[in-house]
């Protein structure tokens, strides 16, 4: 009796179970009553990453330098090329089809997490006791200067954008 279902890595065709082509190869001809499935390797710049019965291999992704992309990992016959962004840029999506410049954190905000090739800068407001007076993609919030440890006193209070200003203590005559 002809099968109605096949094992893993097989497919049903013409009432018989044929082996799927292994990753890196495409289907040329179905198996016959005499022979196994006929498969061929994917060409240069092509890949298939699963056991399959595909008649065409997929083209490797192109990392377009005009979009700020570069190759992070070269593709093989079994894997696609992985793109990432040039220094200072990050991917706009998980598929990394284009890049945008890392965002900078404005004064009053510091960098919580530095950007990577796939994620943007994460900023956080500087809490009380901390400040940032620059727009930067790297600088964290800095703590206010401690006047006391320098035997000085606060002459001007700090904000989230400015440091405290220290000055000498008034001498009692």
């Amino acid at each position: 009796e002809p099968p109605t279902a096949c094992r893993e890595k097989q497919y049903l065709i013409n009432s018989q179970c044929c082996s799927l082509c292994q990753p890196g190869q495409k289907l040329v001809s179905d198996c016959t009553e005499f022979t196994e499935t006929e498969c061929l390797p994917c060409g240069e710049s092509e890949f298939l990453d699963t056991w399959n019965r595909e008649t065409h291999c997929h083209q490797h992704k192109y990392c377009d330098p005009n979009l700020g992309l570069r190759v992070q990992q070269k593709g093989t016959s079994e894997t696609d090329t992985i793109c990432t962004c040039e220094e200072g840029w990050h991917c706009t999506s998980e598929a990394c089809e284009s890049c945008v410049l890392h965002r900078s954190c404005s004064p009053g905000f510091g960098v919580k997490q530095i950007a990577t090739g796939v994620s943007d800068t994460i900023c956080e407001p500087c809490p009380v006791g901390f400040f940032s007076n620059v727009s930067s993609a790297f600088e964290k919030c800095h703590p206010w200067t401690s006047c006391e440890t320098k035997d000085l006193v606060v002459q001007q209070a700090g904000t989230n954008k400015t440091d405290v200003v220290c000055g000498p203590q008034d001498r009692l005559r």
Epitope: I13, N14, L27, V28, S29, D30, T32, F34, T35, E36, E38, L40, R53, T55, H56
Partner: antibody, heavy 116, light 111 residues
């Protein structure tokens, strides 16, 4: 069962044209590469051409490039070989075969004779 | 696209073993495990007897076996029988996505 039934051979003058056909049955024609192989009288086998499942890939032996065209009609389960600008050295038995590079099934063959 | 090189003829007595060689290049035989062997009796279409270097189609006698070393493939027929008398052809897939056959070997079974 698998069958490949050929037609279209015959006698043709040098420079003439001919179209060979191969009607397939007993298998899923559209998921298989197909090929043509020829054999001159008293000589060995010579691979001529093959075509992929949807006709987007076609390959030919150098000696027939630009003169022969392989094609297929998946709706009709048929394979074709158009022979143009025929030469005496194209005289041979032409076989269609199922597959891209190995052939478990062959047509019965059709004789093409190029002679004036 | 040069034909693969096979001996023009080989012979052997019934019961003996014979080997037919098939020599190509690194762009065909040596580069892929896609070597096939065909048996052809006079006036008949070829019959596949070995594929992918070593695989035997179901129904083909286990007296037929295939192997490959570098750019040379071989077909061995053991326990030679009268019905083995035929022409034998090797073929190989090539780096230019084409196929090439050997020139053929005529096998004579003596006696």
């Amino acid at each position: 069962q698998v069958q490949l039934v050929q037609s279209g051979g015959g006698l043709v003058q040098p420079g003439g044209s001919l179209r060979l056909s191969c009607a397939a049955s007993g298998f899923t024609f559209s998921s298989n590469w197909m090929s043509w192989v020829r054999q001159a009288p008293g000589k060995g086998l010579e691979w001529v051409a093959n075509i992929n499942q949807d006709g987007s890939e076609k390959y030919y032996v150098d000696s027939v490039k630009g003169r022969f065209t392989i094609s297929r009609d998946n709706a009709k389960n048929s394979l074709y070989l158009q022979l143009n600008s025929l030469r005496a050295e194209d005289t041979a038995e032409y076989y269609c075969a199922r597959g891209g590079y190995r052939y478990a099934y062959w047509g019965q063959g059709t004789l093409v004779t190029v002679s004036s | 696209q040069s034909a693969l090189t096979q001996p023009a003829s080989v012979s052997g007595s019934p019961g003996q073993s014979i080997t037919i060689s098939c020599t190509g290049t690194s762009s065909d035989v040596g580069g892929y495990n896609y070597v096939s062997w065909y048996q052809q009796h006079p006036g008949k279409a070829p019959k596949l007897i070995i594929y992918d270097v070593t695989n035997r189609p179901s129904g083909v006698s286990n007296r037929f076996s295939g192997s490959k070393s570098a750019n040379t493939a071989s077909l061995t027929i053991s326990g030679l029988q009268a019905e083995d008398e035929a022409d034998y052809y090797c073929s190989s897939y090539t780096s230019s996505s084409t196929l090439v056959f050997g020139g053929g070997t005529e096998l004579t079974v003596l006696g």
